[in-house]
Amino acid sequence: AGVFELQIHSFGPGPGPGAPRSPCSARLPCRLFFRVCLKPGLSEEAAESPCALGAALSARGPVYTEQPGAPAPDLPLPDGLLQVPFRDAWPGTFSFIIETWREELGDQIGGPAWSLLARVAGRRRLAAGGPWARDIQRAGAWELRFSYRARCEPPAVGTACTRLCRPRSAPSRCGPGLRPCAPLEDECEAPLVCRAGCSPEHGFCEQPGECRCLEGWTGPLCTVPVSTSSCLSPRGPSSATTGCLVPGPGPCDGNPCANGGSCSETPRSFECTCPRGFYGLRCEVSGVTCADGPCFNGGLCVGGADPDSAYICHCPPGFQGSNCEKRVDRCSLQPCRNGGLCLDLGHALRCRCRAGFAGPRCEHDLDDCAGRACANGGTCVEGGGAHRCSCALGFGGRDCRERADPCAARPCAHGGRCYAHFSGLVCACAPGYMGARCEFPVHPDGASALPAAPPGLRPGDPQRYL
């Protein structure tokens, strides 16, 4: 057992251009508070997944009012540490989410309004009992500086808080076979109560004779690394040689979740879904009351007047979760038109439009021809977000800038010869044919299939096609 401790040093504008606007104003004074969520392992979990190692809320910071014209400074912070108690072994690797919340203190109906200012997340390795680790994380234009550590609660010691220490029975030395408890040299390591042979690095026990494994280890003595690469089933140890997992007792057998929590298996362990008012790996931590303000996003807290009675958050429309911390997926209704990408920013939906479309919901088909000229007398034709040019005779290409070869399609019939001309093409017809494309045969008596030849042109003369 032990406590994860988080100390926030500063929250304010990060370096570089684009300093954020102050979150508070003379009209809307506000104060900050923080929430930390811890999960075991290095998993890339969604922000909404359970805080299996525990969670904590800070106190509210001092009320802050922006000074007109002044840049946003580092904002005043709550006093004290955020502490997340853990009952079991410290996992050594963990994921964290730290949220900065703003509580507006204006004259809102129904009490203060909360909004999420920034959320940072990371994955770290940390041994219990070590020094404070310092960190800087950026969220947009904001920067959060903080330190954290994990410390064991007596009598536990060690990097995972799994070894137990007891005060010395004699002032000078420990009992037979027992070592001093570094760094607490005035204490002695307690007699081993775990199952004989239980791995001191990867196993621990809470009851005499048991051997429980840390994440990533299995086997009766926690000496077998978990490897699912060549295994068929996700449960239980198979042999000490392969470390494969084959069907065995499931992690949810006997329901390890306390206080009415429901257990679900994960690939390596289990996960408890806790009822309102409880959290922690096994739903063992309680004590949050409505006075702690556990309901986010304007949720209304009911009950929970004392630590023994669970609170319930009544969420406003669009929010859900036991603390109203989860937003309903409004983008699933697909409000963006014309293939636009939907983004739920919380305060509003935004659509990122495809080329050729604009408007809050990508509803406007842009004039594809606006500002786009077709050269050499071509005309612009709109269509589907991309313009094209209908070119004048003798020109081609995307913008009608290329000279077309009018003879490329062999337009002159019956062996007529084609000549390119500045205004089009000219066909020189073979004997016996006439017409713009040499398409008409000349009759033997000198008459043609045409009613009459145009004045000034004799059959066989080149015909210019305009």
């Epitope: 669009g318 697909q334 963006c336 809050p360 990508c362 509803e363």
Partner: nanobody, 120 residues
Framework: QVQLVQSGGGLVQAGGSLRLSCAAS????????MGWYRQPPGKQRELVAG???????KYADSVKGRFTISRDNAKNTVYLQMNSLKPEDTAVYYC??????????????WGQGTQVTVKP
């Protein structure tokens, strides 16, 4: 500014039918997208059926062939006809609408919720 008023719902035996309706009123210029979400006990809210911004119809896989969404544009109303109901359809059903207001802004609105309970 805009109200979504739901009606229908209630208690029904498995295999039975129910019809939900949702009427939008207020400073509405146009309704861009409108549909139905549901939230089963202890679970996330999920889209059941809706008319998207492009006007197409979208259904959750679990209700395809059983639920039908329809609308009356003149009344700014959307309906959800639920047939062959199953116990797992038990949830609070919420109407949702993405509305273009008279000032040309777009806002997303929720109805008050309607309980649907399907007995085995």
């Amino acid at each position: 500014q805009v109200q979504l008023v739901q009606s229908g719902g209630g208690l029904v035996q498995a295999g039975g039918s129910l019809r939900l309706s949702c009427a939008a009123s207020g400073s509405i210029f146009s309704i861009n997208a409108m549909g139905w979400y549901r939230q089963p006990p202890g679970k996330q809210r999920e889209l059941v059926a809706g008319f998207t911004g492009d006007g197409s119809t979208k259904y959750a896989d679990s209700v395809k062939g059983r639920f039908t969404i329809s609308r009356d544009n003149a009344k700014n109303t959307v309906y959800l006809q639920m047939n062959s109901l199953k116990p797992e359809d038990t949830a609070v059903y919420y109407c949702a609408a993405d509305v273009q207001l008279l000032n040309s802004d777009y806002e997303f609105y929720w109805g008050q919720g309607t309980q649907v309970t399907v007995k085995p």
